[in-house]
């Protein structure tokens, strides 16, 4: 029989559940722990102070608790302040709490004292340097100055001049005596340890204003813009460069060590980028404003003046043209030029054009032309309409035929084609 059915094994309201292994297990209500919920939960009373997290455990039939304390607190119930919180240990020493509740610092080598702030003078504790080396105390450590013939941190090794090699920049070390060496330097370097980069610029071949820049066993020439090549001996063809060396349509001509531009009208300067100020030589009359343009200028005239230089009186000021005509001034002589509206003619556009007498009759279909001021009218014959009698009047539009008769439009009249049994003009 399943174990949960043989009378519940769970005490204190624990709920019996069957595990996959067919064993019984108890799910305890708050306040109880243990296999059968038979023990009071020590965490239930909230024994951990502050924000301490309580964890209960059952060991040998007894319920116990432990507190996981937040930063800055310690003790079984997190009620004691943590002395390590203020980082009292210097120089990376490890901080722990002693039995008395105070901090303890585990000092790294070279430091001592309660907070590991005191430097240990290794030079006074015995003689760490061998073979007569001079001990020099340093913060947290010491250094040995070795006598000739010895090397190593404690002067413990007999010196080999080329191990490690003192030669720099790829130089090769050669031992020349017990304690001496020579460096065979790579090309471009010199000095006892090949530490000096030879200046290759004396006697350089940079021409045409090129500047020598030293390299390793070589040099480079920084050329002015008109020259190129390894030694600045190649002329730059500025006319091949993009963007064009000559602006605003100027023509480029390469020269040896430069170029020249032939500018189009209106432009000047080495690269044709300056617009010539044509107003500097312009003679706009007094009161006019000169505006520079490319290879030209424009005089903005004051009221009453006209002409290219504003040197003429504007004849249009006196309104010589008939109303609706457009007045312009001849820029050469200042006289008024009247542009007439339709229907008028004459120098001042004040003469009516008789449209009925010039050329063919403007009225179609024998309409009668009547001249009017600035225009004309057409009096149309019977059957025609429109401004020029151009439209045939459709007399059928008014639907004059009766009794489903068909209307035929004629010029100035209509005809009704009657259905059987009807007669009359309108088939009425």
């Amino acid at each position: 029989a399943p174990p949960c059915l043989d009378g519940s094994p769970c005490a204190n309201g624990g709920r019996c559940t069957q595990l996959p292994s067919r064993e019984a297990a108890c799910l305890c209500p708050p306040g109880w722990v243990g296999e059968r919920c038979q023990l009071e939960d020590p965490c239930h009373s909230g024994p951990c102070a502050g924000r301490g997290v309580c964890q209960s455990s059952v060991v040998a039939g007894t319920a116990r608790f432990s507190c996981r304390c937040p930063r800055g607190f310690r003790g079984p119930d997190c009620s004691l302040p943590d002395p390590c919180l203020s980082s009292p240990c210097a120089h990376g020493a490890r901080c722990s709490v002693g039995p008395d509740g105070r901090f303890l610092c585990s000092c790294p080598p070279g430091y001592q004292g309660r907070s590991c702030r005191s430097d240990v003078d290794e030079c006074r504790v015995g003689e760490p340097c061998r073979h007569g080396g001079t001990c020099l105390n340093t913060p947290g450590s010491f250094r040995c100055q070795c006598p000739a013939g010895y090397t190593g941190p404690l002067c413990e090794n007999p010196a080999v001049p080329c191990a490690p090699s003192p030669c720099r920049n790829g130089g090769t070390c050669r031992q020349s005596g017990d304690l001496t060496y020579d460096c065979a330097c790579l090309p471009g370097f010199e000095g006892q340890n090949c530490e000096v980069n030879v200046d290759d610029c004396p006697g350089h071949r940079c021409l045409n204003g090129g500047t020598c820049v030293d390299g390793v066993n070589t040099y480079n020439c920084q050329c002015p813009p008109e020259w190129t090549g390894q030694f600045c001996t190649e002329d730059v063809d500025e006319c091949q460069l993009q963007p064009n060396a000559c602006h605003n349509g100027g023509t480029c001509f390469n020269t040896l060590g430069g170029h020249s531009c032939v500018c189009v009208n209106g432009w000047t300067g080495e690269s044709c980028s300056q617009n010539i100020d044509d107003c500097a030589t312009a003679v706009c009359f007094h009161g006019a404003t000169c505006h520079d343009r490319v290879a030209s200028f424009y005089c903005a005239c004051p009221m009453g003046k006209t002409g290219l230089l504003c040197h003429l009186d504007d004849a249009c000021v006196s309104n010589p043209c008939h109303e609706d005509a457009i007045c312009d001034t001849n820029p050469v002589n200042g006289r008024a030029i009247c542009t007439c509206p339709p229907g008028f003619t004459g120098g001042a556009c004040d003469q009516d054009v008789d449209e009925c007498s010039i050329g063919a009759n403007p009225c179609e279909h024998l309409g009668r032309c009547v001249n009017t001021q600035g225009s004309f009218l057409c009096q149309c014959g019977r059957g025609y309409t429109g401004p020029r009698c151009e439209t045939d009047v459709n007399e059928c539009l008014s639907g004059p035929c009766r009794n489903q008769a068909t209307c035929l439009d004629r010029i100035g009249q209509f005809t009704c084609i009657c259905m059987a049994g009807f007669t009359g003009t309108y088939c009425e």
Epitope: N208, T233, E234, V236, D237, C239, Q240, T255, L256, S260
Partner: antibody
């Protein structure tokens, strides 16, 4: 016919001066860059000076720099070479040459040459 | 300065036979902007030099097609496919890539 005609050569003492001329005809002289080239007796050719079409740009090799001056008068269609502080090694036939194009710097027209002899 | 070395210094050729002149420069004549400015001139006896070939291989106007130029970098060649009596004279190679512009020492061509 396109022609260059040099003149002004002659015998001059070391340290002396001479001015050579090159008269151009048959082409638009002001449109071309020009140079002087010399040829020592029985020797090769040596370029000695250059001037641009408008005269604004000149160039000399180290052998004559500071002693020779090239110039031109476009209104007279004439090229000049002023030679000062002449030395024995300046003895040569001096040719004026026209540059066909300022992109390639070769000489497409040469004069017939004028002889300069520097001797004491 | 760029030194131009011509070989041979003299050449005796049978009419109708080919001839070849070599020109070597002490530096590459390829300009940074791409072109190679190597030219050939002929100086006939008692005359001034005249242009034959410009920019390595371009025949100047009026130059017969028996003349041809080739090469690149530092090595260049002038070839005459069939030498004629009028081809006698001194041939000069010249470079205008680097200033100062320089000429070869010349190759004297004569007819056998």
């Amino acid at each position: 016919e396109v022609q260059l005609l040099e003149s002004g050569g002659g015998l001059v003492q070391p340290g002396g001066s001479l001015r050579l001329s090159c008269a151009a005809s048959g082409f638009a002289f002001s449109h071309y860059d020009m140079s002087w080239v010399r040829q020592a007796p029985g020797k090769g050719l040596e370029w000695v000076s250059y001037i641009s079409r408008g005269g604004g740009s000149t160039y000399y090799p180290d052998s004559v720099k500071g002693r020779f001056t090239i110039s031109r008068d476009n209104s007279k269609n004439t090229l000049y070479l002023q030679m000062n502080s002449l030395r024995a090694e300046d003895t040569a036939v001096y040719y004026c040459g026209r540059h066909a194009t300022t992109a390639y710097w070769y000489f497409d027209v040469w004069g017939q040459g004028t002889m300069v002899t520097v001797s004491s | 300065d760029v030194v131009m070395t011509q070989t041979p210094l003299s050449l005796s050729v049978t009419p109708g036979q080919p001839a070849s002149i070599s020109c070597r420069s002490s530096q590459s004549l390829v300009h940074t902007q791409g072109n190679t400015y190597l030219h050939w001139y002929l100086q006939k006896p008692g005359q001034s030099p005249q242009l034959l070939i410009y920019k390595v291989s371009n025949r100047f106007s009026g130059v017969p097609d028996r003349f041809s130029g080739s090469g690149s970098g530092t090595d260049f060649t002038l070839k005459i496919s069939r030498v004629e009596a009028e081809d006698v004279g001194v041939y000069f190679c010249s470079q205008s890539t680097h200033v100062p512009w320089t000429f070869g020492q010349g190759t004297k061509v004569e007819i056998k």
